[in-house]
């Protein structure tokens, strides 16, 4: 008789999840000398321990503390790039601008990027069939709690000028319900962070509007200002040219507005 299994609304754990996490850890620690001391088996054990045998709607930040401890990493606090709904361009940017870091350029972010995982209460099995959806099932699921935890820590570590890349093609350029809007914004430390600089990325080729005047950007400015943090905003009209100019700043076409 097959054992009854909870059916959740979201996709199940990414196939070969344990192998993927372990392989990513090994690769990352090989590439980043400052993380060579990390024992990837211990990292996987701590990761697994955060959600295995636990109800996938009752996960807490405390469950991830052993993993957070093992993945402790120092990134230059003044070189942090946050992003919202525009992950690919943010990652392309930090691949070129090597001295800047998104969360996914850190070990923990790199391990979990684009993966899904969950377990089941009282069994050591990983659920490959379905996992809780944030909206339809519950917010305290393994994936959401992980990203909330690492995002909070990442924002708390930031200092000086913090940059955020925002998608100007979205109806809500700044979305209060995104991870950036609900977690990172509220965990920037005014004692350390002087300015939040938003880069609003335009989608259309002929889009010359000043999206920094968008009502949601004004709302972001007001929230940030109330934290005694300065706010600035730049339109990136041509993201393709923007990346090209990051690669080749000497290019003659890079002196004009991007």
């Amino acid at each position: 008789v097959p054992r009854w299994r909870q059916q959740w609304s979201g996709p199940g754990t990414t196939k070969r999840f344990p192998e993927t996490v372990l392989a990513r850890c090994v690769k990352y620690t090989e590439i980043h000398p400052e993380m060579r001391h990390v024992d990837c088996q211990s990292v996987w054990d701590a990761f697994k321990g955060a959600f295995i045998s636990k109800h996938p709607c009752n996960i807490t930040e405390e469950d991830y503390q052993p993993l957070m401890k093992l993945g402790t990493q120092t990134v230059p606090c003044n070189k942090i790039l946050l992003w919202s709904r525009i992950k690919d361009l943010a990652h392309q940017f930090t691949q070129v601008q090597r001295d800047m870091f998104t969360l996914e350029d850190t070990l923990l972010g790199y391990l979990a990027d684009d993966l899904t995982w969950c377990g089941e209460f009282n069994t050591s099995k990983i659920n490959y069939q379905s996992c809780p959806d944030w909206r339809k099932d519950c917010s305290n699921n393994p994936v959401s709690v992980f990203w909330k935890t690492v995002s909070r820590r990442f924002a708390e570590a930031a200092c000086d000028v913090v940059h955020v890349m925002l998608n100007g093609s979205r109806s809500k350029i700044f979305d209060k319900n995104s991870t950036f809007g609900s977690v990172e914004v509220h965990n920037l430390q005014p004692e350390k962070v002087q300015t939040l600089e938003a880069w609003v990325i335009h989608g259309g080729r002929e889009d010359s509007r000043d999206l920094c005047q968008d009502p949601t950007i004004k709302e972001l400015e007001s929230i940030i200002s109330k934290r005694n943090i300065q706010f600035s905003c730049k339109n990136i009209y041509r993201p393709d040219k923007f990346l090209q100019c990051v690669k080749n700043p000497e290019d003659s076409s890079c002196t004009s507005e991007i």
Partner: antibody, heavy 114, light 108 residues
Framework: VKESEGGLFKPTDTLTLTCTVS????????VIWVRQAPGKGLEYIGF???????YYANWAKSRSTITRNTNENTVTLKMTSLTAADTATYFC???????????WGPGTLVTVSS | DMTQTPASVSEPVGGTVTIKCQAS??????LSWYQQKLGQPPKLLIY???TLASGVSSRFKGSGSGTEYTLTISGVECADAATYYC????????????FGGGTEVVVK
Amino acid sequence: VKESEGGLFKPTDTLTLTCTVSGFSLSSYGVIWVRQAPGKGLEYIGFVAVGGTTYYANWAKSRSTITRNTNENTVTLKMTSLTAADTATYFCVRNGVSGSSDIWGPGTLVTVSS
Amino acid sequence: DMTQTPASVSEPVGGTVTIKCQASQSIYSYLSWYQQKLGQPPKLLIYSASTLASGVSSRFKGSGSGTEYTLTISGVECADAATYYCQQDYSGSNVDNTFGGGTEVVVK
């Protein structure tokens, strides 16, 4: 944090109050203006942020202007077209930790009467 | 924007007073509480919904998240007789008032 003297004003007059701050920089902390009519509750007027951007309560937008002078450590509230309903004690307040109003001036009484 | 209840409460010395504050939308725990005595400016008691301001008695306790917040005064003393206000510290724009209407606390 200290507000300049208020006093007696006539309807349609323009109110100008100056807040002088010491012990902290206007580049590090925003400043809020709040008022309180006699026997009534606290009412937010507006605020000048560390970057110099100003924000106002919806009711105050059309006739209030907040400016700052970082060199002189002063913040000024200007309110036009006064009516008797603007009679209140006006407070200048530091926008402190987590956006709370942590340091209050003693307040200054403004009376609008013909 | 901020609905505060009750408008007035009377409590004997040693009792417990509970004041509630509701925001029209989530303010992400950016809520502070103030005590105001007659003829004085308000005094900050609690910020970030639950953090006690410097020098404030631990008899004052703040709690809540999202849109619902509570100030609890336990072991009420005569010196607690005052008007208490909540304030949302989330944003200073597009608001009518950032303060609640106030609660008068009478100590019997």
